[in-house]
Interface confidence: medium
């Protein structure tokens, strides 16, 4: 903490001005009025203060607003935001998307810091749900944002917000997250025609159940192998060879290169070798001819 010293004669700050960069830390503490700083926060970001000087300015604001800064100050924090701790941010009530954008801009190009994560958490909780504009903003700054949320948090995303999601925003999502997002996407895109629907739904298919994959196989969608490899194994296993062939279209040849990887490997083990041979790809590992296939899951359900 900076010790209290009297402001030297003639150095009392009358405005937040670029010349303050040459004030020593103790002079800033003694000569800059916290209320003046709060009303002229918009100027601070344009002034190249040292990190040590920013510490002093933060200290002054902390003294003025011990219960947390008002949004009028928060919106203009600029680089001073980088000095805030998650504990500081938890005291804030940020309601304006413009404020959120202004602070995310400061951290642009960097990984999501604990401060940013706390800020976003406070903002979203304050809004009650992840609306489209918020999601638009967050994924623009952090493409991986959506995949950083828990399935429980994702459940608060309204289907209308799904329109803001880009394929790259889902790159790091795991199956549990896609299980939550897929039904929302299906609902959001339900009024689109076949080919347009597939383009939009494709990134979410890691959460699709078997019946939806069967339905897609009837629509000449030509799913690429990269998408197929991200499908839920339990959703792929019940598909027949004919259904997979229709689902992949010309991409079916790519199965050979992936035959040792899930879900292709597990799917092959469930197919009759005769059926696999019809693909002409040399896929091996299917059920030999003459063997009886027992659907144990069905048997368990009946007993």
């Amino acid at each position: 903490e900076v010790e209290k010293t009297a402001c030297p004669s003639g150095k009392k700050a009358r405005e937040i001005d670029e010349s303050l960069i040459f004030y020593k830390k103790w002079e800033l503490e003694a000569c800059v009025d916290a209320a003046l700083l709060a009303t002229q926060m918009d100027r601070v970001n344009a002034i190249p203060f040292t990190y040590e000087q920013l510490d002093v300015l933060k200290h002054k604001l902390d003294e003025l607003y011990p219960q947390g800064y008002p949004e009028s100050v928060i919106q203009h924090l600029g680089y001073l935001f980088l000095k805030m701790s998650p504990e500081d941010i938890r005291k804030w009530n940020v309601t304006s998307l413009e404020t959120l954008k202004a602070l995310l801009e400061v951290n642009k190009g960097h990984e999501m810091s604990p401060q940013v994560a706390t800020l976003i958490d406070r903002f979203v909780k304050g809004r009650g749900q992840l609306d489209k504009d918020t999601l638009d903003t967050l994924t623009a700054f952090y493409p991986g944002y959506l995949c950083s949320l828990s399935p429980e948090e994702l459940s608060s995303v309204p289907p209308s917000s799904i329109w803001a999601v880009r394929p790259q925003d889902l790159d790091t999502c795991d199956p549990r997250q896609l299980d939550v997002l897929y039904p929302k996407a299906r609902l959001a895109f339900q009024n689109m025609n076949g080919s347009e629907y597939f383009v939009k739904i494709q990134s979410f298919l890691g959460g699709a159940p078997t019946e939806d994959l069967k339905a897609l196989s009837q629509q000449n969608v030509s799913m690429d192998l990269a998408t197929f490899m991200k499908l839920r194994t339990d959703a792929v296993l019940p598909l027949t060879v004919a259904e997979v062939q229709k689902l992949l279209g010309p991409h079916v040849e790519g199965l050979k290169a992936e035959e040792r990887h899930r879900p292709v490997r597990d799917w092959i083990l469930r197919q009759r070798q005769d059926d696999l041979d019809t693909l002409g790809l040399g896929l091996q590992g299917g059920i030999p001819n003459g063997y009886l296939v027992l659907d144990l899951s069905m048997q368990e359900a009946l007993s």
Epitope: A13, R14, D17
Partner: antibody, heavy 117, light 107 residues
Framework: EVQLVESGGGLVKPGGSLRLSCAAS????????MNWVRQAPGKGLEWVSS????????YYADSVKGRFTISRDNAKNSLYLQMNSLRAEDTAVYYC??????????WGQGTLVTVSS | DIQMTQSPSSLSASVGDRVTITCRAS??????LNWYQQKPGKAPKLLIY???SLQSGVPSRFSGSGSGTDFTLTISSLQPEDFATYYC?????????FGGGTKVEIK
């Protein structure tokens, strides 16, 4: 194009006075701190004085404190340096320079002040 | 006041040479160091700011490094137009102070 043009230099006797001017163009003069930097013949650079955008803050090097006065007229896009009680060691080329962030950029072409009897 | 010490005060080099100029501050100035080039009869011109950031329009053969008290200006391959005097300047606190300069001459 950002430009600074100094004027007012010349020969003056020790103890005399001189007023330098700097005309600015090509940028919003009222938004920047302005400075005077000098260079004695064959020597290095020495910062002389600084004035903030709205004249709220003024700084001087110890070597000129109490003798020189910096001022500005934002309406005229002009910077001034009133030099009193001049000494032989004040002989130098005086440059006007804009402070942008924490750097001097750009500089004027300079005006020569010679203090000699 | 923060004193800035430059070395060498002068050096002779040939076109194509790699040239290094050092600047030392009497106390830590973080990265608040600038480099200027001055040719005879001309005003100084900003080359590098914040220790390592190249000013727009300055050739990439110029580079700066360092933080705290020790800084370096490097010209990777000296060109005929680079023969001049170079100054470092701290912008950490007033009074703003310059190094004594390094004159780069033709060998």
């Amino acid at each position: 194009e950002v430009q600074l043009v100094e004027s007012g230099g010349g020969l003056v006797k020790p103890g005399g006075s001189l007023r330098l001017s700097c005309a600015a163009s090509g940028f919003t003069f009222s938004s920047y701190s302005m400075n005077w930097v000098r260079q004695a013949p064959g020597k290095g650079l020495e910062w002389v004085s600084s004035i903030s955008s709205s004249s709220s803050y003024i700084y001087y090097a110890d070597s000129v404190k109490g003798r020189f006065t910096i001022s500005r007229d934002n309406a005229k896009n002009s910077l001034y340096l009133q030099m009193n009680s001049l000494r032989a060691e004040d002989t130098a080329v005086y440059y006007c320079a804009r402070l942008r962030g924490r750097v001097f950029d750009p500089w004027g072409q300079g005006t020569l002040v010679t203090v000699s009897s | 006041d923060i004193q800035m010490t430059q070395s060498p005060s002068s050096l002779s080099a040939s076109v194509g040479d790699r040239v290094t100029i050092t600047c030392r501050a009497s106390q830590s100035i973080s990265s608040y160091l600038n480099w200027y080039q001055q040719k005879p009869g001309k005003a100084p011109k900003l080359l590098i700011y914040a220790a390592s950031s190249l000013q727009s329009g300055v050739p990439s053969r110029f580079s700066g490094s360092g933080s705290g008290t020790d800084f370096t200006l490097t010209i990777s391959s000296l060109q005929p137009e680079d023969f001049a005097t170079y100054y470092c300047q701290q912008s950490y606190s007033t009074p703003l102070t310059f190094g004594g300069g390094t004159k780069v001459e033709i060998k």
